[in-house]
Amino acid sequence: DAHKSEVAHRFKDLGEENFKALVLIAFAQYLQQCPFEDHVKLVNEVTEFAKTCVADESAENCDKSLHTLFGDKLCTVATLRETYGEMADCCAKQEPERNECFLQHKDDNPNLPRLVRPEVDVMCTAFHDNEETFLKKYLYEIARRHPYFYAPELLFFAKRYKAAFTECCQAADKAACLLPKLDELRDEGKASSAKQRLKCASLQKFGERAFKAWAVARLSQRFPKAEFAEVSKLVTDLTKVHTECCHGDLLECADDRADLAKYICENQDSISSKLKECCEKPLLEKSHCIAEVENDEMPADLPSLAADFVESKDVCKNYAEAKDVFLGMFLYEYARRHPDYSVVLLLRLAKTYETTLEKCCAAADPHECYAKVFDEFKPLVEEPQNLIKQNCELFEQLGEYKFQNALLVRYTKKVPQVSTPTLVEVSRNLGKVGSKCCKHPEAKRMPCAEDYLSVVLNQLCVLHEKTPVSDRVTKCCTESLVNRRPCFSALEVDETYVPKEFNAETFTFHADICTLSEKERQIKKQTALVELVKHKPKATKEQLKAVMDDFAAFVEKCCKADDKETCFAEEGKKLVAASQAALGL
């Protein structure tokens, strides 16, 4: 399927609007510090060049790969060395090493100012004055802060962003209309970014086989009526799409994703009965809808798995002849029967089955050796079930904020070397599992909770990888993708940790806390809690609760005071002294 000019091919397939948007996303994800105007200029130059290639595919440089064209363009940025330091060395390399070099320099936690939302009227004016620039700016700001955001999905977010402004800037109460929509987009966007980050980590750190296994399990749960060959085809295509997006090949990725959506909709009958509505939508909505579609009903009267995977005399023959195909079939058959299991649990079961066959298919009595393999699954299934039950009970008892605090204490004691902002961010997200999943019936709790926790723990892993400080985090993050959560769950208090020196400044608060949103105020308090545990890792729950209750009362009291700043200064000193005494600091 070779084209004389790859850039012309993609321009024609995607259309000018999507082409420009995707090139902007690609550039912003690579050069995260570059000003918006510089990126727009680069994108316009690339677009003009693409148009010359559409007109004449044999024109000069039109035969170059997209990596070569884009890389050459990025390397024309004048301030590359000053702004990016050693990333500038990438430009001395040839493709494909140059692109790999750019990928390695993507920063999951770029030093960029927090996005502050302007007043609604200001936003509406900007939207009306120059809609195109306004939307490009949205793509740019999201892409540079989320360098692995799933590009075709970001186009869908931008479309919804545009629709929100189009509708709400004409509404009587613009703010009431717009702000909830923007909050929803922000929260969904963060979730989408984190989910995609896990996919890219899976591909980049654990390889294509790991991603394919994940995809087989998930698609088999979602499309249990589809044949194994059909699921395998979808997995192959989906792997290609995500490999491209994670590798910075955003034009190819978006194009292939559109082809995959088209294929799925053309073959609905052999895939799932739940796709009808999705397939009636326009492209971006269609692809999003398919990605989120509910699980189809399981076929009736599925036979026992034991027949083919334990009792058959051909188990070892089938395994030895095509290991990955046979394991894929096992995973498919198990997953389609268990929409109530998390994908990571299904992958643990498949790994256990694989390990057993590796051992038993070399044994003198293979059948006797693997006869009880399904018995080994029981504790693997029960462990997440029990954990979720316990934590949902705790969540229901405490509510989200206090549940987050319990997790903050738990995780700070496990890995106290991790930076406080990372511990706060990760623990807050871990705590959201309660409101997200505990409301579900038993049959939906585990896939909701454990697969969500995998996404959140991956955030910890990618942030920690940038500046590694804990061997325990490194170990849990790198040893096994599917066992990350059990690995972190199993960590006890780090007895080797030397408590942090007490610093009164850390616990000094000012009147500005009173004007913060409830969320920001919670983060301030949770930051203090983490610091408290770092100073006194052996503090009991009761001690910490007492100090935090005193702290909450102190903030409430001073925020009601006439002279807030004086109150914070004087009462703060008393609180610090009382807390030190209570904790024996």
Partner: antibody, heavy 118, light 106 residues
Framework: QVQLQQSGAELVRPGSSVKISCKAS????????MNWVKQRPGQGLEWIGQ????????YYNGRFKGKATITADKSPTTAYMQLSSLTSEDSAVYVC???????????WGQGTTLTVSS | QIVLTQSPAIMSASPGEKVTMTCSAS?????MHWYQQKSGTSPKRWIY???KLASGVPVRFSGSGSGTSYSLTIRSMEAEDAATYYC?????????FGAGTKLEIK
């Protein structure tokens, strides 16, 4: 590269016991069965049994139950076979061999000669 | 246990001659493996999983068979092929070996 290094020749009295060793290197010792095979002079090969060092599981040829005891130690990556109540019938070369999927033996030790004589 | 009968027990062949030896099982086996042994050395895996050549084995060797009947064939005998060849079955406990076919060069 994979290597199986066996202990040296043994000359022992009838009725006594002997423990021969097979030191493995160059692969993940825990993840492969270690087999023991007997070969008497000028005769064929006879499978004695096997051990999976990862969890200590064993299988024996019924003819050697009570005669041979196979063990393994993961830290020096060594498999052992103890032979008890020795008679002249036990005089043979004993070879360790790594077992792989579908039951073939891809690497063999150099053999340990056992002579049982009064 | 499954008994493997190898035939012939001893055979000789001239260089360039085609050689076939057989291994017959007392009941059906899943896979057959073949080993070459020269005097004073340990056996070497020669053909495994019925028909796959072990690393370093010349392509003039081949293996085939199913059920109870298996064979090892040398397309064109060479002097270095003179050795004893043992078959071994897998799929039934205990694992068993044939008594061997001793191949000599004429």
């Amino acid at each position: 590269q994979v290597q199986l290094q066996q202990s040296g020749a043994e000359l022992v009295r009838p009725g006594s016991s002997v423990k021969i060793s097979c030191k493995a290197s160059g692969y993940a010792f825990s993840n492969y069965w270690m087999n023991w095979v007997k070969q008497r002079p000028g005769q064929g090969l006879e499978w004695i049994g096997q051990i999976y060092p990862g969890d200590g599981d064993t299988y024996y040829n019924g003819r050697f139950k009570g005669k041979a005891t196979i063990t393994a130690d993961k830290s020096p990556t060594t498999a052992y076979m103890q032979l008890s109540s020795l008679t002249s019938e036990d005089s043979a070369v004993y070879v360790c061999a790594r077992g792989v999927i579908l039951g073939s033996f891809d690497y063999w030790g150099q053999g340990t000669t056992l002579t049982v004589s009064s | 246990q499954i008994v493997l009968t190898q035939s012939p027990a001893i055979m000789s062949a001239s260089p360039g001659e085609k050689v076939t030896m057989t291994c017959s099982a007392s009941s059906s086996v899943s896979y057959m493996h073949w080993y070459q042994q020269k005097s004073g050395t340990s056996p070497k895996r020669w053909i495994y999983d019925t028909s796959k050549l072990a690393s370093g084995v010349p392509v003039r060797f081949s293996g085939s068979g199913s059920g109870t009947s298996y064979s090892l064939t040398i397309r064109s005998m060479e002097a270095e092929d003179a050795a004893t060849y043992y078959c071994q079955q897998w799929g039934s406990n205990p694992l068993t070996f044939g008594a061997g076919t001793k191949l000599e060069i004429k």
